[in-house]
């Protein structure tokens, strides 16, 4: 049994680290590796992720861990059995990969404006909280032509678009994600989709 | 009521061995690290080792280094400190204490909270 | 090994009055905000020592609150507001960042 791609890491930098590999060959991941990961801090223990199948030769670990801070350094060991196919560590402050934004909401009944909301992934107390800004990309299935990035820059997850910029009488879809510009982070996964109609007509002497 | 308490102290020559042994009460044991500390006569306190709470991470003072060995029976609640090749700088009292939350990822510290009364250890020929 | 250098090594107070004991550590040990592994001890005659202060500035359970630490990094101060007669014996600093864990010299607080 061999690693084809080793283990890399990101975190949520909050409880939660993900981390993607690739075997050799078709590989049973939950029945036959295990991924064990130490806090290189007074005291600690090993702790142990049981992988899941990602694709055939796939395999990924999500490692519970506590709230990240930037002096922790993680050492991961991958067993197969009694066998050790990889070693290595793992620094989840320089690997950072924000959660997703959610509960994105599009307000249509404010007067020429589409209003789209959503809400920080983060609580409060967490360092990412006011660090996070956003992308809000907006699409039409009516018109392929049509999909634009908003980039929000500002704390307030909120974005408003002129009615007036965007077709009437057809569909849009937007989705938001975010990154840490001070954590020097990766982009999140997108939000899901939400769907709204565009019914906003002009004024008849604007037209 | 949360508890430490030592036994096998006494009187050895140099180069003996003698076996402490630290019983807990009051706690979840193998949820936390455990640490001995020692005082010499007139003298402040010396760090001697530490363990993790499932007892897979010890830890020593390098004046014990190769001569004591730290140990544990969570089923017994008990704290152990083998200690071979005894010198006369080991004649001190001898105090177990609890050390942090090691169950969790980083482990939580919440200080050396509670300490036993102490075992008196004598080397002298 | 992380070397703790306490100040004063005898500290001779009138009862009422406060009380200030300082403790340097050779590097830093702050561990992320707000969580500096450093502990305050006090030891009577013919007792075990007990925890007063931990993480630097946390009141361990049942301790008065007369007793208060602060600093960060590798300056550290434990306060006594008010002494008392009670309050005598020697005080350790220890540092718990990394085995192996060191102590203070030790500060004989005594009643005038």
């Known amino acids: 049994m061999k690693v084809l791609q080793e283990p890399a890491c990101v975190s949520d930098y909050m409880s939660i680290s993900t981390c993607e590999w690739k075997m050799g060959g078709p590989t049973n991941c939950s029945a036959e590796l295990r991924l064990l990961y130490q806090l290189v801090f007074q005291s600690s223990e090993t702790h142990t992720c049981v992988p899941e199948n990602n694709g055939g030769v796939g395999c990924v670990c999500h490692l519970l861990m506590d709230d990240v801070v930037s002096m922790d350094n993680y050492t991961l060991d991958l067993w197969a059995g009694q066998q050790l196919l990889w070693k290595g560590s793992f620094k989840p402050s320089e690997h950072v990969k924000p959660r997703a934004p959610g509960n994105l909401t599009v307000h249509t009944n404010v007067s020429d404006t589409v209003l789209l909301t959503w809400s920080n992934p983060y609580p409060p107390d967490n360092y990412l909280y006011n660090d996070l800004t956003y992308a809000v990309n907006i699409w039409s299935e009516n018109d392929p032509a049509y999909s634009r990035i908003h980039n929000v820059t500002y704390l307030k997850p909120t974005l408003r678009i002129p009615a007036s910029t965007l077709k009437s009488g057809i569909s849009y879809r937007a989705r938001v994600r975010a990154w840490a510009q001070h954590y020097n982070t990766t982009w999140s996964e997108w939000s899901p989709s939400t769907k709204w109609y565009n019914s906003y007509r002009e004024p008849f002497e604007q037209r | 009521e949360v508890q430490l308490v030592e036994s096998g102290g006494g009187l050895e020559q140099p180069g003996g061995s003698l076996r402490l042994s630290c019983a807990g009460s009051?706690?979840?044991?193998?949820?936390?690290?455990m640490t001995w500390v020692r005082q010499a006569p007139g003298k402040g306190l010396e760090w001697v080792s530490s363990i993790s709470g499932s007892g897979s991470s010890t830890y020593y003072a390098d004046s014990v280094k190769g001569r004591f060995t730290i140990s544990r029976d969570n089923s017994k609640n008990t704290l152990y400190l083998q200690m071979n090749s005894l010198r006369a700088e080991d004649t001190a009292v001898y105090y177990c204490?609890?050390?942090?939350?090691?169950?969790?990822?980083?482990?939580?510290?919440?200080?050396?909270?509670?300490w036993g009364q102490g075992t008196t250890v004598t080397v002298s020929s | 090994d992380i070397v703790m250098t306490q100040s004063p090594l005898s500290l001779p107070v009138t009862p009422g009055e406060p009380a200030s004991i300082s403790c340097r550590s050779s590097?830093?040990?702050?561990?992320?905000?707000?969580?500096?592994?450093v502990d305050w001890y006090l030891q009577k005659s013919g007792q075990s020592p007990q925890l007063l202060i931990y993480?630097?500035?946390k009141r361990a359970s049942g301790v008065p609150d007369r007793f208060s630490g602060s600093g960060s990094g590798t300056d550290f101060t434990l306060k006594i507001s008010r002494v008392e007669a009670e309050d005598v014996g020697f005080y350790y600093c220890m540092q718990a960042l990394t085995t192996p864990y060191t102590f203070g010299q030790g500060t004989k607080l005594e009643i005038k």
């Open positions: 009051g706690f979840t044991f193998r949820d936390f690290a």
């Open positions: 204490a609890k050390d942090r939350l090691s169950i969790t990822v980083r482990p939580r510290y919440y200080g050396l909270d509670v």
């Open positions: 590097q830093s040990l702050l561990y992320s905000i707000g969580y500096n592994y």
């Open positions: 993480l630097g500035n």
